[in-house]
């Protein structure tokens, strides 16, 4: 039974005579007259078992004391700490040359834990131990025991255990405490890697390389290694582990981020507070959830605040110039907390009678500098139809607009393009031809570009070749041209007029009047 005594963490005690309750019962040779076990009071007035010998008056002393078998426990080098007290030879009257002030320390390796006898020749000498302090008989009365402490080491050891022996050659000495221990580098955590208890190497200069294992919730960055030095100290940490995402280093452990904090990657950083407009409701968050109405773009870092789509642009102004429109606006009041704002233009062509019936403008319309992804707050739109109702929407967008279920970030304006000269009339037909007249009809121009005020019909005899022509005006899309000569070829042109002016004449329609008083119905451009 041993009592508990506290020693350094890097020392593992194999034998401690001070912790043994009752007699030690070591083997002495000779059995009597040499070493004897004596109980004394220590400095705390506690009885301790000691071995003493004081055969100082007789020469040629050879008194041996051997410990019980001491297990090696895998240690290759062990340390022997001896606390002893020695009586000064000068305090013993007349002992002359017979008194010594040293003793010898030996060891013997053995797999046998029950050797009963001391065979001196089996033992290997470790050292001769001398005292730093000795005392005279008088000193004992002061209640201060003058202890010498000597430490020796021995190794490499290879058998299961060993015995220690103390040889007295004529000193007055007491072994107050014998402690045998080996050194280990104690279990430790360094750079988030755990290194196990490691017994030191066989040599006093050896280093034992030990690979560490990452603590819970961490991963290797570089292979963690350390060296266990002969003195039981860890040396030269190499490599390290990093706390996993959602965990940070606290007291040598990787502990989960607290609620309201997060850590996105395996780094040596600490958990960060959730960015603005986000939260975490569990420990160990690797990212924070955006508040309602806030979003995070795909390429946004977890450290960025959650943002929202911008509000609508402000102060949209339109400037119509015939079939072009210039639009300008101001930035939204709320950019949603983002810098990546841009603008998209949506163009809709709407009916005059019913503005709700709008259709996309199509590809014929051109936008300068561009229709989508505008970085400026103005755009020029060209190639519109004249005298047409258009609705233009300016959409403010940013990196999270696509996540927004409520499209409320646009401002719109409806404009009507100015009237322009109409386009040419595509098809003119001779509906009825007589000897003296031709009835014409035509379609409205493809692009009236305004309100058609009238149509102008220009005609002339073909052989006159426009040297002499006549004009007939009509608001309708048909007219009768009378007073023509029979059997004569005429060329007809039709054009439309709006408030902005005349359009181009149509392609010529050639018609020959009849010779007989009959009626010819024609629909070609060159009726004969």
């Amino acid at each position: 039974v041993t009592g508990s005594r506290v020693y350094p963490a890097n020392e593992v005690t194999l034998l401690d005579s001070r912790s043994v309750q009752g007699e030690l019962g070591w083997i002495a040779s000779p059995l009597e007259g040499g070493w004897e076990e004596v109980s004394i009071m220590d400095e705390k007035n506690t009885p301790i078992r000691t071995y003493q010998v004081c055969n100082v008056m007789e020469p040629s002393q050879n008194n041996w004391l051997r410990t019980d078998w001491i297990t090696r426990e895998g240690a290759q080098r062990v340390y022997i700490e001896i606390k002893f007290t020695l009586r000064d030879c000068n305090s013993l009257p007349g002992v002359m040359g017979t008194c010594k002030e040293t003793f010898n320390l030996y060891y013997y390796e053995s797999d046998n834990d029950k050797e009963r006898f001391i065979r001196e020749n089996q033992f290997v000498k470790i050292d001769t131990i001398a005292a730093d302090e000795s005392f005279t008989q008088v000193d004992i009365g002061d209640r201060i025991m003058k202890l010498n402490t000597e430490i020796r080491d021995v190794g490499p050891l290879s058998k299961k255990g060993f015995y220690l022996a103390f040889q007295d050659v004529g000193a007055c000495i007491a072994l107050v405490s014998v402690r045998v221990f080996y050194k280990k580098c104690p279990l430790t955590v360094r750079n988030l890697a755990q290194f196990p208890d490691t017994i030191t190497g066989a040599d006093t200069s050896s280093l034992v390389e030990v690979r560490g294992s990452c603590v819970n919730n961490s991963e290797e960055k570089d292979v963690p290694k350390m060296y266990c030095g002969a003195d039981g100290e860890w040396l030269v940490p190499i490599g390290n582990c990093l706390c996993n995402a959602g965990h940070e280093e606290r007291s040598g452990e990787c502990q989960a981020c607290k609620i309201g904090y997060y850590k996105a990657l395996s780094t040596d950083a600490t958990c960060a507070k959730c960015p603005p407009h986000s939260y975490s409701v569990w420990e160990g968050a690797t990212s924070c959830t955006c508040d309602r109405g806030f979003f995070r773009a795909d390429n946004d870092a977890a450290s960025m605040p959650c943002t929202r789509p911008p509000s609508a642009p402000l102060n949209l102004i339109s400037n119509v110039n015939e079939t072009s429109v210039n639009l300008e606006w101001s930035s939204p009041q709320n950019t949603g907390g983002r810098q990546d704002i841009s603008y998209n233009v949506v163009c809709k062509k709407c009916g005059a009678g019913d503005p709700s019936k709008c259709r996309p403008c199509g590809s014929g319309v051109h936008y300068t500098p561009q229709q989508n992804g505008l970085k400026t707050t103005k755009v020029s739109i060209t190639d519109l139809l004249a005298h047409t109702n258009y609705t233009f929407e300016i959409w403010a967008v940013n990196g999270v607009s696509k996540y927004n279920p409520n499209p409320d970030q646009s401002v719109s304006v409806t404009v009507t393009t100015n009237q322009a000269a109409p386009s040419s009339i595509a098809l003119v037909q001779a509906k009825e031809v007589t000897r003296y007249s031709v009835a014409l009809a035509w379609l409205e121009p493809d692009r009236p570009n305004g309100v058609i005020l009238e149509y102008e019909v220009k005609y002339y005899e073909k052989d006159q070749n426009e040297r002499s022509y006549r004009i007939v005006r009509t608001a309708a899309r048909n007219t009768d041209i009378k007073g023509l000569n029979p059997l004569t070829s005429y060329v007809f042109h039709v054009r439309a007029r709006t408030a902005a002016g005349y359009g181009d004449f149509s392609e010529p329609l050639e018609v020959t009047t009849n010779t007989v008083p009959s009626r010819i119905i024609g629909d070609g451009a060159n009726s004969t």
């Epitope: 009071m41 003493q52 007789e58 008989q137």
Partner: antibody, heavy 121, light 106 residues
Framework: QVQLLQSGAEVKKPGASVKVPCKAS????????MSWVRQAPGQGLEWMGW????????TYAQGFTGRFVFSLDTSVSTAYLQISSLKAEDTAVYYC??????????????WGQGTLVTVSS | EIVLTQSPATLSVSPGERATLSCRAS??????LPWYQQKPGQAPRLLIY???TRATGIPDRFSASGSGTDFTLTISRVEPEDFAVYYC????????FGQGTKVEIK
Amino acid sequence: QVQLLQSGAEVKKPGASVKVPCKASGYTFTSRAMSWVRQAPGQGLEWMGWINTNTGNPTYAQGFTGRFVFSLDTSVSTAYLQISSLKAEDTAVYYCARVRTTVYGDNMDVWGQGTLVTVSS
Amino acid sequence: EIVLTQSPATLSVSPGERATLSCRASQSVSSNLPWYQQKPGQAPRLLIYGASTRATGIPDRFSASGSGTDFTLTISRVEPEDFAVYYCQQYGPSWTFGQGTKVEIK
């Protein structure tokens, strides 16, 4: 077996001398000092001093100098206590005792049976 | 000179009882003082040395303790053969004995 053998009782007249022998056996005589202790009738023990059996060097306690002499004959492993000029108050049992010197101090571990010295006119 | 005073001078106990003997020094001495037992008509014999080491042949009902100036010899259960006079001794430069405590049958 370790033994200290003392002589029988002595009756002396005042002024005479007496030499009390103490023969040791069972151990090496010169390895331990020898101490002398007096015990007057009905009284306690009184330490007289000791002699180093190796060197013959004596140490006397206070009150036991002058008339008291410790001596040795190592050839026969015997220590002697000689008292001269005996007085009536010297009447006592005289013990020889082997001194056990230890690191922690000294004691007397083996005692002779004692010699009664009676001083009477 | 260091004076050792033992008390009581006489201790009356019945066999089987516990006996506690005191030894007080006039100044501090080593805690490892020896005790001796002397029966009538016999030489003293060493009882205890060191702090509490019993001499050869001494039964374990005898124990000793103390330090500084106060020391105690205890007989846990007195046996008939224990009735005797007990002396403490100190070993400074000059040795001295206590005057003794007589343990007698009650």
